[in-house]
Amino acid sequence: CKAMHVAQPAVVLASSRGIASFVCEYASPGKATEVRVTVLRQADSQVTEVCAATYMMGNELTFLDDSICTGTSSGNQVNLTIQGLRAMDTGLYICKVELMYPPPYYLGIGNGTQIYVIDPEPCPDSDF
């Protein structure tokens, strides 16, 4: 089988501070040394890119400085964290993995993680 399987949790609840973390694990059919991981958000039929990082196996994941994502890698497993989430960001977040080098190229698309974000209630004013 030449397809690459990508596994990610079905549901994750963001913290009250708007932070959600999940693991994206891929079964590599080859010995990849350079991998690109992209987080996509699917809302209705629209798919948008949330963040992306390319890394060398054994090295750390480096997202752009202004990215809302951070992550670490260990073997064929990537631990992703998305920050700054609000209730309106609730949706399906898909992990996409591309084995860029060496050949052959492989694409892996996860089934998506439904991230639920609940905006914290504002603190009531105290009467003293």
């Epitope: 089988c1 030449k2 397809a3 690459m4 399987h5 059919p29 350079e34 690109r36 992209t38 996509l40 798919v47 948008t48 890119e49 992306a52 898909i94 996409k96 860029m100 080098y101 050949p103 052959p104 190229y105 492989y106 694409l107 892996g108 698309i109």
Partner: antibody, heavy 118, light 108 residues
């Protein structure tokens, strides 16, 4: 408007060279991998080449390996295909295509005709 | 290389009838990585179906895809005059990216 427009096709003699261009507009070009696909007259679609987001990774069909070179200029929103040592069997309409975020080719140019003949 | 074989080569159907096109892969293709395209004479291909069964933006619901592993199907439930064209399947899960040889859907 989201579109791809190819140019640079024409008539060339066997052994000659040609450079195809593909101008992208209406989307963030650097966020997409790109391909060249060709179609010989009356035949089916044949994938030719792939280039990654930043141009660091390139793949080629065996039929063009060593003769064709794909490149991109993200500052100019442009994709290129340098074709050397052209053969009669390279005669085809050449399309540039965008890889959608989920993998299939969701946007195609109108194509440019390359004819290799003496 | 994954070889995709489409059948039949030509399908003669009357408008309003159902058309069923087949695509068989030489080895297993994950359903997330199988697409169908439509091409009319003198035009570029147009993406119809991706991920084996998801319709691309703007594609009418008379087009549907199914299948998994090595066997995939494109079904056009009621052929409209504009549906007579050549249809290609494609796998995009690994390089080299490959297309089937095409099925021509013609008016009976």
């Amino acid at each position: 408007e989201v579109q791809l427009v190819e140019s640079g096709g024409g008539l060339v003699k066997p052994g000659g060279s040609l450079r195809l261009s593909c101008a992208a507009s209406g989307f963030t070009f650097s966020s997409y991998t790109m391909h060249w696909v060709r179609q010989a007259p009356g035949k089916g679609l044949e994938w030719v080449s792939f280039i990654s987001y930043d141009g660091n990774y390139k793949y080629y069909a065996d039929s063009v390996k060593g003769r064709f070179t794909i490149s991109r200029d993200n500052a100019k929103n442009s994709l290129y295909l340098q074709m050397n040592s052209l053969r009669a069997e390279d005669t085809a309409v050449y399309y540039c295509a965008r890889t959608s975020l989920l993998g299939p080719f969701d946007l195609w140019g109108q194509g440019t005709m390359v004819t290799v003949s003496s | 290389e994954i070889v995709l074989t489409q059948s039949p080569g030509t399908l003669s159907v009357s408008p309003g009838e159902r058309a069923t096109l087949s695509c068989r892969a030489s080895q297993s293709v994950g359903s997330s990585y199988l697409a169908w395209y439509q091409q009319k004479p003198g035009q570029a291909p147009r993406l119809l179906i991706y991920g084996a069964f998801s319709r691309a933006t703007g594609i009418p619901d008379r087009f549907s895809g199914s299948g998994s592993g090595t066997d995939f199907t494109l079904t056009i439930s009621r052929l409209e005059p504009e549906d007579f064209a050549v249809y290609y399947c494609q796998q995009y899960g690994s390089s080299p990216w490959t297309f089937g040889q095409g099925t021509k859907v013609e008016i009976k």
